[in-house]
């Protein structure tokens, strides 16, 4: 999935792996690997729930849809799918639930037609910054990826590296600006506490962004301004307390957007006034009549659309001498 600019550096380091494991694949064009099911008519290979520990080397050249789900792959090395001739037709690759904890630089190189990649439900403790770009060049050749599904890839707490998980994922998304053509990005159920501010600005082609079921508290530093093609933004089941004016204006300015905000712990105090006003006027929020307050206690379960400015007050901050314990 890369061009010369994005390959030379990563491939030189991966040559020993390739020489031993890939060069020796039987070059038969249409055989079906052991433990897999193949349909040439459907251009599909399924190696599902077979406890495979590595990617089969003898994948048929016709494969367009490859399912490698429910296996025990553990590590995806550089050139894991590199074959000669390349798997030039492979467009959709599903690796979900295959116990991957490491994806190395250049793992998806030499898949020139790869449009859809699903790595969901793998505990990715180590996702190389160059997993998708294949290169440590500042600007890589464009990846053909259009859909990247990364739902529930957060590893257990004790398996995480001593670094920000959000930062690791974002580094892989932004490396070499290779994913400029990405249209769908799903990052649901990853315990994200924040969204690094530069990530969306560098994914200008996004149509669909799913950040549901995370732990996002605020979108204050996130800019949606560049995402002029964005059609759906899923923010359900996060920890959002309020959306501020800047965010509201940016969302309203996106011509095709639909926003999903259900099941967030909205704090209905004086800071919520702008959002309530906006909700009453906007058409971009789907199911806006379902949004309810979580705090303060007296406002719990009140419907946001039914609130008025008199309902949204902030208790005065008392000077320390008057505060009670």
């Amino acid at each position: 999935s890369s061009s010369p600019t994005s390959s030379a550096s990563s491939f030189s380091s991966s040559a020993p792996f390739l020489a031993s494991a890939v060069s020796a694949q039987p070059p038969l064009p249409d055989q079906c690997p052991a433990l897999c099911e193949c349909s040439e008519a459907a251009r599909t290979v399924k190696c599902v729930n077979r406890n495979l520990t590595e990617v089969p080397t003898d994948l048929p050249a016709y494969v367009r849809n490859l399912f490698l789900t429910g296996n025990q792959l553990a590590v995806l090395p550089a050139g894991a799918f590199a074959r000669r001739p390349p798997l030039a037709e492979l467009a959709a690759l599903n690796l979900s639930g295959s116990r991957l904890d490491e994806v190395r630089a250049g793992a998806f190189e030499h898949l020139p037609s790869l449009r859809q990649l699903d790595l969901s439900h793998n505990p990715l403790a180590d996702l190389s910054p160059f997993a998708f770009s294949g290169s440590n060049a500042s600007v890589s050749a464009p990846s053909p990826l259009v859909e990247l599904i990364l739902n529930h890839i957060v590893p257990p707490e004790d398996e995480r590296q001593n670094r920000s998980f959000e930062g690791m994922v974002v580094a892989a998304l932004l490396a070499g600006r290779a994913l400029q053509g990405l249209r769908r990005l799903e990052l649901a159920s990853n315990h994200f506490l924040y969204l690094p501010r530069d990530v969306l600005a560098q994914l200008p082609s996004l149509r669909h962004l799913d950040l549901s079921n995370n732990s996002l508290v605020s979108l204050t530093y996130v800019s949606f301004r560049n995402l002029t093609h964005l059609e759906s933004l899923h923010l359900e089941d996060n920890a959002l307390k309020v959306l501020h004016n800047g965010t509201l204006a940016e969302l309203q300015g996106l011509p095709h957007i639909r926003v999903f905000l259900d099941n967030n712990p909205w704090v209905c105090d004086c800071h919520m006034a702008d959002m309530v006003t906006w909700l009453k006027e906007t058409e971009v929020v789907q199911g806006k009549d379902r949004l309810t307050c979580a705090y303060p206690e007296k406002m719990r379960n009140r419907v946001l659309l039914e609130l008025n400015s008199a309902d949204l007050d902030c208790d005065p901050i008392l000077p320390p001498s008057l505060q009670t314990s």
């Epitope: 061009s3 010369p4 020489a19 060069s23 020796a24 070059p27 038969l28 050249a61 000669r84 001739p85």
Partner: antibody
């Protein structure tokens, strides 16, 4: 260093067969495929097929199915191509080359074997 | 099969010249394009793989570029030892196919 040594020139009769050899040295023979390429006098190059010495697996250009048969002997690190039912159209220089996925290319070539079909 | 076309079958240039040889594929070959040099004695060498990767031992005056269906080989400073025929080859699909070759000679 990688070296592919091919057998010598052949002058053969129409309708007979010929077997060209390609002895590999300087690398692990079973870790790379061997490709075969045809070049008719004053013409371009035509890919015949490929053999994986490790598995014996082969893949042929449709134009050479039934004409060429590729084999390999791991013990001597030698690949072979047999050409059958020879006609004047088969008069050409035949090259073996090492195929590699690291480079997506044929990175080292034999010196070529001239096959002349004549009565 | 993918057709590879080298429109220029022969090319005359002077020593020190910058020479460009082009190659066109009948469909997008996604950078899987190699260049080979065949000397007058028949020996064949890989020069460039995957559009632009210089093979080990090949002088840096050789370079490759291109994308999609159009590719080129450039010799930046022609030397006597570069007199040869140059072939392009696609490596994306069996059967691998070669261009017809471009013969380079000295003016």
């Amino acid at each position: 260093q990688v070296h592919l040594q091919q057998s010598g020139a052949e002058l053969v009769r129409p309708g007979t067969s010929v077997k060209v050899s390609c002895k590999a040295s300087g690398y692990a023979f079973t870790n790379y495929v061997i490709e075969w390429v045809k070049q008719r006098p004053g013409q371009g190059l035509e890919w015949i097929g490929v053999i994986n010495p490790g598995s014996g697996g082969t893949n042929y250009n449709e134009n050479f199915k039934g004409k060429a048969t590729l084999t390999a002997d791991k013990s001597s690190s030698t690949a072979y191509m047999q050409l059958s039912s020879l006609t004047s159209e088969d008069s050409a220089v035949y090259f073996c080359a090492r195929g590699t996925v690291e480079l997506y290319a044929m990175d080292y070539w034999g010196q070529g074997t001239s096959v002349t079909v004549s009565s | 099969d993918i057709q590879m076309t080298q429109t220029t079958s022969s090319l005359s240039a002077s020593l020190g010249d910058r020479v460009t040889i082009s190659c066109r594929a009948s469909q997008d070959i996604s950078y899987y394009l190699n260049w080979y040099q065949q000397k007058p004695d028949g020996t064949v060498k890989l020069l460039i793989s995957y559009t632009s990767r210089l093979h080990s031992g090949v002088p840096s005056r050789f370079s490759g570029s291109g994308s999609g269906t159009d590719y080129s080989l450039t010799i930046s400073n022609l030397e006597q030892e570069d007199i040869a025929t140059y072939f392009c080859q696609q490596d994306i699909k069996h059967p691998y196919t070669f261009g017809g070759g471009t013969e380079l000679e000295i003016k």
